[in-house]
Interface confidence: medium
């Protein structure tokens, strides 16, 4: 899922398989002057960042799971 | 919708009514050593930050709308 870089988007391509347990936070960025695309940037527990495909049902599931996360997790 | 920038929970209270068009980005933070709660922090286009209730169906709708956002918006 390659993303056009000409508008200074931060996501050059997106990662397919990512496990929710490895995610520390997910930032959903609306389109703006820097980029005409919606961008989803996950920060992993090891400090790395990865771009996710906003159109992916898996990404929507991951975010939904995070929102409904049991506090004891 | 107070936000505290510490290595603890950042959200002291959550804001109820917020319009997606005012949101620049939404950060969903999983529970971790800094905070036992899932936190949802919206950065507004005016630079302000607002904490949203992760359990709110409205918040889930807002994020879903952002993920499915038409690029021309």
């Amino acid at each position: 899922a390659s993303v056009v870089t000409e508008l200074r988007c931060q996501c050059l391509q997106t990662l397919q398989g990512i496990h929710p347990k490895n995610i520390q936070s997910v930032n959903v960025k609306a389109p703006g002057p820097h980029c005409a695309e919606t961008e989803v940037i996950a920060t992993l527990k090891n400090g790395q960042k990865a771009c996710l495909n906003p159109a992916s049902p898996m990404v929507q599931k991951i975010i939904k799971k995070m929102l409904n996360c049991d506090k004891s997790n | 919708a107070s936000v505290v920038t510490e290595l603890r929970c950042q959200c002291l209270q959550t804001l109820q009514g917020i319009h997606p068009k005012n949101i620049q980005s939404v950060n969903v933070k999983a529970p971790g050593p800094h905070c036992a709660e899932t936190e949802v922090i919206a950065t507004l286009k005016n630079g302000q930050k607002a904490c949203l209730n992760p359990a709110s169906p409205m918040v889930q709708k807002i994020i879903k709308k952002m993920l499915n956002c038409d690029k021309s918006n």
Epitope: E6, R8, Q10, L12, P33, H34, Q48, K49 | -
Partner: antibody
């Protein structure tokens, strides 16, 4: 070793032209955006222009728009800044900078992580 | 254009001190902000990227924080080599803009 080397600076009269070059080595030049940044004597940093990796998109500060042209030759690993209609206020040290900052293959943060040593441009009669 | 305002513009401190430099954006820039250090006669050097991430090889006494409009660069236990000028820079949108700089001098 990753390196940027500017050349082409010098003394020019107001209204004149100069072409700055920046030779890159040690990285895949065509993959990364590049910028020119200048610094007038005793002043702060001012971004001048940027160009995408392919050269397909260019960006300019308002102060140089219509007078300066950024370009690149990826086959020669070289970045250029063509400066026309030069003014006294264009006097500065000009730096080229790589807009690196790719974390893994999946995230790009456009940081100017490698800079040249700078080339001085003096516009004076 | 997004304006970046740094404060203070100059600062005197001693070796071992903890210093804080702030940078404010005229509109929200998410975490799209970098910090650079420049010594006289030298090119700038990247210290912090994306507001809070330490560039490789930069000592851990440097740290950054903030997002949205307000950002901070902190230097813990100042060393002699830290006396320099510091700049913030936003990359949220072009034109890219730098703060006016903060000159850190020895007291």
């Amino acid at each position: 070793e990753v390196q940027l080397l500017e050349s082409g600076g010098g003394l020019v009269q107001p209204g004149g032209s100069l072409r700055l070059s920046c030779a890159a080595s040690g990285f895949t030049f065509s993959e990364l955006s590049m910028s020119w940044v200048r610094q007038a004597p005793g002043k702060g940093l001012e971004w001048v222009s940027a160009i995408s990796g392919s050269g397909g998109s260019t960006y300019y500060a308002d102060s140089v728009k219509g007078r300066f042209t950024i370009s690149r030759d990826n086959s020669k690993n070289t970045l250029y800044l063509q400066m026309n209609s030069l003014r006294a206020e264009d006097t500065a040290v000009y730096y080229c900078a790589r807009e690196g900052g790719r974390l893994e293959p999946y995230y790009y943060y456009y940081a100017m992580d490698v800079w040249g040593q700078g080339t001085p441009v003096t516009v004076s009669s | 254009d997004i304006q970046m305002t740094q404060s203070p513009s100059s600062l005197s401190a001693s070796v071992g001190d903890r210093v804080t430099i702030t940078c404010r954006a005229s509109q929200s820039i998410s975490d799209n902000l970098h910090w650079y250090q420049q010594k006289p006669g030298k090119a700038p050097k990247l210290l912090i990227y994306d507001a809070s991430n330490l560039e490789s090889g930069v000592p851990s006494r440097f740290s950054g924080s903030g997002s949205g409009t307000d950002f901070t660069l902190t230097i813990n236990s100042l060393q002699p080599e830290d006396f320099a000028t510091y700049y913030c820079q936003q990359y949220y949108s072009t034109p890219l803009t730098f703060g006016q700089g903060t000159k850190l001098e020895i007291k």
